[in-house]
């Protein structure tokens, strides 16, 4: 559910569901700030541009972060 990014946290609920890295358009890791005291991970999916809040503590999501960072390091010269 959308809430103003500058005012507060964004995620009302979180998902533990595994996400296929290939289906990701973008992965945002938003660190704690004065606006939101929690880390929030927001995945933008290629299909319909759907955005999902992911559970930073979930094993599946931690694996996703590893896979994405590995993919990025491969691409960077």
């Amino acid at each position: 559910i959308p809430l103003s990014r500058t005012v507060r946290c964004t995620c009302i609920s979180i998902s533990n569901q595994p996400v296929n890295p290939r289906s990701l358009e973008k992965l945002e890791i938003i660190p704690p700030s004065q606006f939101c005291p929690h880390v929030e991970i927001i995945a933008t999916m290629k299909k319909k541009g759907e955005k999902r809040c992911l559970n930073p503590e979930s094993k599946a999501i931690k694996n996703l972060l590893k896979a994405v960072s590995k993919e990025r390091s491969k691409r960077s010269p």
Epitope: I1, P2, L3, S4, R8, C9, T10, C11, I12, S13, I14, S15, N16, C36, P37, H38, I42, E50, K51, R52, C53, L54, N55
Partner: antibody, heavy 124, light 109 residues
Framework: QVQLVESGGGVVQPGRSLRLSCAAS????????MHWVRQAPGKGLEWVAV????????GYADSVKGRFTISRDNSKNTLYLQMNSLRAEDTAVYYC?????????????????WGQGTTVTVSS | EIVLTQSPGTLSLSPGERATLSCRAS???????LAWYQQKPGQAPRLLIY???SRATGIPDRFSGSGSGTDFTLTISRLEPEDFAVYYC??????????FGPGTKVDIK
């Protein structure tokens, strides 16, 4: 099975306080946003408050703002509603409800699981 | 704040008939943010439709939702005896605020 059970209702005098509880079971409570909704006798549904999975987001209906506080204890799988400065018009059945799939930003999945309700009567 | 109006207040129909319930918003509402609920006397509400047109788990296909902008509709194609109840529309608005309509009672003619 997925279940929500409210407790803490009763008869209370105007101006007094009451705390409602909602015990959740059968799902990962700490992943879900939660709501309180009330229904006055013979009337329709009125949304009261919402809290995000980690308590970072809270929202209230204008009618209860400044008097009611929603909170949760994820270690106990329990949702709370602290009601202060109670008025006769707060008399209602209070339901707790789970946000359907609030992880999907820009889409509202409704309240998909409801408790059976607990009755609050404010009367002198 | 967005206000939802439901009409008619009461709908008197016979089993087997089609029921059309209206929900009108005072300002435009994203169809992604509209839901419908059913409530029977002495029971908690039950989610029927979310996202204006998606049926919730276990809801029979005689229930359907449609609409956009300010006008939304819940249709029950053929009323079954268990469908006589009160129906509420609900919308999500930022802040976060969640608003219910006043309800439409569907009773037996």
């Amino acid at each position: 099975q997925v279940q929500l059970v409210e407790s803490g209702g009763g008869v209370v005098q105007p101006g007094r306080s009451l705390r409602l509880s909602c015990a959740a079971s059968g799902f990962t409570f700490s992943d879900y946003g939660m709501h309180w909704v009330r229904q006055a006798p013979g009337k329709g549904l009125e949304w009261v408050a919402v809290i995000s999975h980690n308590g970072a987001i809270k929202g209230y209906a204008d009618s209860v703002k400044g008097r009611f506080t929603i909170s949760r204890d994820n270690s106990k799988n329990t949702l709370y509603l602290q009601m202060n400065s109670l008025r006769a018009e707060d008399t209602a059945v209070y339901y707790c409800a789970r946000e359907g799939d609030g992880s999907n930003i820009y889409y509202y999945y409704g309240m998909d699981v409801w408790g059976q309700g607990t009755t609050v009567t404010v009367s002198s | 704040e967005i206000v939802l109006t439901q009409s008619p207040g009461t709908l008197s129909l016979s089993p087997g008939e089609r029921a059309t319930l209206s929900c009108r918003a005072s300002q435009s509402v994203s169809s992604s943010y509209l839901a419908w609920y059913q409530q029977k006397p002495g029971q908690a509400p039950r989610l029927l439709i979310y996202g204006a047109s998606s049926r919730a788990t276990g809801i029979p296909d005689r229930f359907s939702g449609s609409g956009s902008g300010t006008d939304f509709t819940l249709t029950i194609s053929r009323l079954e005896p268990e469908d006589f109840a009160v129906y509420y529309c609900q919308q999500y608005g930022s802040s976060p605020i969640f608003t219910f309509g006043p309800g439409t009672k569907v009773d037996i003619k």
